[in-house]
Interface confidence: low
């Protein structure tokens, strides 16, 4: 980009520097050159001469018009050709923007991940505006009626010990940029029901040798929720679909989930977990591998899970909570 | 916000067919895959079957080789077949949003009103 350069003379946009992509712009250059009366005046995008849509407006200006604009940053500058100078002289540059006002932001959403000390609150921006833009949370007690703001350029953690004025509380957003502003609905939430356990870990697997041989998960969360509710998934690693159980969970002792599984095929699983009733699951767990033998018992343990890593596997997805996209979490 | 509509609920005898049908409307930013559950009186709302935007599809055990889950993409509706109908199959049947979620962008899900499906022996 174009940041401190030394001009002779001036370039400009209309309608201006920062612009709604797909507009029709003009770019001004006007040469201010000590001795110097320009043959001719060329202008350059990302250093590229521009060949065409350029008109002479008089001695010392020229304008170069573009239809459509649709590159999101581009850097122009203008040059003169002088008499007796050999190479062009610099009249001056400028960095243009082009881009779309914010969206209104929806599906504003916070959650308190157990033990973080944070609210993490977010919400789909809508669709890229490819310029600078920013947000401005804004958290009211209902309570105390007190109003926090806090400025972030995406997603926002805030820290429940500044959340002194109870339990209730009005989110909204509000975003800008140089095109436009606008403000999300307003979410109303209470912080008992926004909590999201912590994370439920898979740490080992056995297959116990018997007349129906029979798999044994293992696992465990350092939750201090007493009603939990968890979900397993589990395929063949050669699968798409998933099994899913469902279990009701206390988590003062380590899990044990039974499977019955077919012998010398290896298995991925996953849990996730949210408090009995509420809204928001956890993402799903790290992928956790388990082969089961042909015969002889087997256990896995979370310290080889990197040896049993097949890198030919497409962990396909869905995000219902029963299936999700490069195991990314799914809290809704 | 998205609407969801379910329908094709009904009466039929053990053993028989219904196939579900949960149509989407209504515009979001978000990417959605579709969920069904199913709540049998007095009973806690159950996962039955899921399905994504590329197709992959999930099942709970209890219906896993009787139940297939589809959907149209064109007609933004998402099927459940419904085969081997048994008594404990007996619930209101109900279709959901699932939002494809990352640290940025959370989606709220939504829910539909349901459809009742009443399978006798």
């Known amino acids: 980009g174009i940041t401190n350069i030394n001009c002779s003379g001036h370039i400009w946009v209309e309608p201006a520097t920062i612009f709604k992509m797909g507009m029709n712009i003009s770019i001004y250059c006007q040469a201010a050159i000590k001795n110097c009366q320009p043959r001719k005046l060329h202008f350059y995008k990302n250093g590229i001469k521009e060949r065409f849509q350029i008109t002479r407006i008089n001695k010392t200006t020229a304008r170069l018009w573009y239809k459509n604009f649709l590159e999101p940053h581009a850097s122009m500058y203008c040059t003169a050709e002088c008499p007796k100078h050999f190479q062009e002289t610099l009249i001056c540059g400028k960095d243009i923007s082009s881009g779309y006002p914010p969206d209104i932001p929806d599906e504003v959403t916070c959650v308190i991940y157990e033990y973080s000390g944070n609210m993490t609150c977010t919400w789909n921006a809508g669709k890229l505006t490819y310029i600078d833009t920013k947000y401005v949370v804004h958290v009211k007690s209902l309570e105390t009626e007190e109003e926090q703001q806090y400025l972030t350029s995406s997603y926002i953690n805030i820290s429940t010990d500044s959340l002194q004025g109870g339990k209730k509380y009005l989110v909204w957003v509000q975003a800008a940029n140089a095109l436009g502003m606008e403000e999300s609905k307003q979410l109303q939430i209470h912080l008992d029901d926004i909590v999201i356990p912590s994370a439920a870990v898979i740490s080992r697997a056995e297959t116990i040798n018997a007349t129906v041989p029979k798999t044994i998960i293992y696992w465990d969360s350092q939750t201090t929720i007493e009603k939990v509710s968890c979900e397993m998934r589990y395929k063949a690693t050669t699968n798409q679909t998933w099994n899913v159980k469902e279990f009701d969970t206390n988590f003062t002792y380590v899990q044990q989930s039974e499977f019955y599984l077919e012998p010398n095929i290896k298995y991925v699983f996953q849990v996730r977990c949210q408090e009995t009733g509420k809204r928001y699951w956890q993402p799903w767990s790290s992928l956790f591998f388990h082969k089961t033998p042909e015969t002889v018992p087997q256990v896995t343990s979370k310290a080889f899970q990197h040896d049993t890593w097949n890198s030919g596997l497409t962990v396909a997805s869905i995000s219902t909570g029963h299936l999700t996209s490069d195991n990314r979490g799914d809290i809704g | 916000q998205v609407q969801l509509q379910e329908s094709g609920g009904g009466s039929v005898q053990a053993g028989g067919s219904l196939r579900l049908s949960c149509a989407a409307s209504?515009?979001?930013?978000?990417?959605?895959?579709i969920a069904w559950y199913r709540q049998a009186p007095g009973k806690e709302r159950k996962f039955v079957s899921a399905?994504?935007?590329?197709?992959?599809?999930s099942y709970a055990d209890s219906v896993k080789g009787r139940f297939t889950i589809s959907q149209d993409n064109a007609k933004n509706t998402v099927y459940l077949q419904m085969n081997s109908l048994k008594p404990e199959d007996t619930a209101m049947y109900y279709c959901?949003?699932?939002?494809?979620?990352?640290?940025?962008?959370?989606?709220?899900?939504?829910w539909g009103q349901g459809t009742q499906v009443t399978v006798s022996s």
């Open positions: 399905i994504a935007s590329d197709g992959i599809t």
């Open positions: 959901k949003t699932d939002p494809i979620s990352t640290i940025t962008r959370i989606c709220d899900p939504y």
């Open positions: 209504g515009y979001t930013y978000c990417n959605y895959d």
